[in-house]
């Protein structure tokens, strides 16, 4: 039985192979039970967590994880050397930066050590699974009487990231948002000096260095407006 698994992270070529044992028709071998899907995320290209739902197993099982890179110099099968645990049962594996090769096909295999034929293999494009750290050091500059410029920093190469800026006033019920490319600058041309504004930003590893769907966490918000500091009306950055 060869089953295609569609993951929520753009890896449509992901496949899983489930190996069945021969069995009488009136009984179901444990080997037919599908293994949980493995979900991997690469955090800021610093480390990667590959996790699975250990509670989906009918009984507590320490599943094992192996990985390799398809058609590359790194095609030797590697054992997980740093397991993550949930209630003393393996639920994931953490790989360090030196083990992450973004543009090679990453193959991850989950196995039940008590039933070696019960295993599932997935192929992942790691460049589509990168989640950067949240933007930092948000600052606002007053360019003119009614124009504000928002700047921020990322702990990754700017040209690999796109951004989403959200802002609203205390009078608004919802956020207004705008996409920003790798230049990571945002201007608000018309600011009402009587209102207090809140801004926040998140970033994504797309489209230059990967095609990730997942955004970073939101930055800490930054505020501008009616209760701004009187000392310097041209630069004000207050983190909530």
């Amino acid at each position: 039985l060869n089953t295609t698994i569609l993951t929520p992270n753009g890896n449509e070529d992901t496949t899983a192979d489930f190996f069945l044992t021969t069995m009488p028709t009136d009984s179901l071998s444990v080997s037919t039970l599908p293994l949980p899907e493995v979900q991997c995320f690469v955090f800021n290209v610093e480390y990667m967590n590959c996790t699975w739902n250990s509670s989906s197993e009918p009984q507590p099982t320490n599943l094992t994880l192996h990985y390799w890179y398809k058609n590359s110099d790194n095609d030797k099968v590697q054992k997980c050397s740093h397991y993550l645990f949930s209630e003393e049962i393996t639920s994931g594996c953490q790989l360090q930066k030196k083990e992450i090769h973004l543009y090679q096909t990453f193959v991850v295999q989950l196995q039940d050590p008590r039933e070696p034929r019960r295993q599932a293999t997935q192929m992942l494009k790691l460049q589509n699974l990168v989640i950067p750290w949240a933007p930092e050091n948000l600052t606002l500059h007053k360019l003119s009487e009614s124009q504000l410029e928002l700047n921020w920093n990322n702990r990754f190469l700017n040209h690999c990231l796109e951004h989403l800026v959200q802002y609203r006033t205390d009078w608004d019920h919802s956020w207004t948002e705008q996409s920003v490319d790798y230049r990571h600058k945002f201007s608000l041309p018309s600011v009402d000096g009587q209102k207090r504004y809140t801004f926040r930003v998140r970033s994504r590893f797309n489209p230059l260095c990967g095609s990730a769907q997942h955004w970073s966490e939101w930055s800490h918000p930054i505020h501008w407006g009616s209760n701004t500091s009187k000392e310097n009306p041209f630069l004000f950055a207050l983190e909530a």
Epitope: N71, L102, Y103, Q104, L157, H159, P207, L208, C209
Partner: nanobody, 117 residues
């Protein structure tokens, strides 16, 4: 073994143009973003431009935007950089590198661009 060979540099007057090439081998060229960087005399390595693996997205340093154009031909495993409206401050050794320009792996041998009247 990854090999990158840059070519196309030379001496050019301010306002002139050059086209740099980088021929790659030893890896799956079409799977990787590719980057141009440069190093001026006595300066550190400066990122210039990066292109996505499929060529569909590009990014440029502010100092070269609008003057330089990065492109690639995956069938030929070749990366290009078109340099127009050259300025004296563009004088540098130009390197291509596999990936998005994080400094690993090391670039190739480079090609020298000198802008002088």
């Amino acid at each position: 073994q990854v090999q990158l060979q840059e070519s196309g540099g030379g001496l050019v007057q301010p306002g002139g143009s050059l086209r740099l090439s980088c021929t790659a081998s030893g890896f799956s060229f079409s799977s990787y973003p590719m980057t141009w960087a440069r190093q001026a005399p006595g300066k550190g390595l400066e990122w210039v431009s990066t292109i996505a693996s499929d060529g569909g997205s590009t990014a440029y340093a502010a100092s070269v935007e609008g003057r330089f154009t990065i492109s690639r031909d995956n069938a030929k495993s070749t990366l290009y950089l078109q340099l127009n409206s050259l300025k004296t401050e563009d004088t540098a050794m130009y390197y291509c590198t596999k990936g998005y320009g994080d400094g690993t792996p090391a670039p190739g041998q480079g090609t020298q661009v000198t802008v002088s009247s």
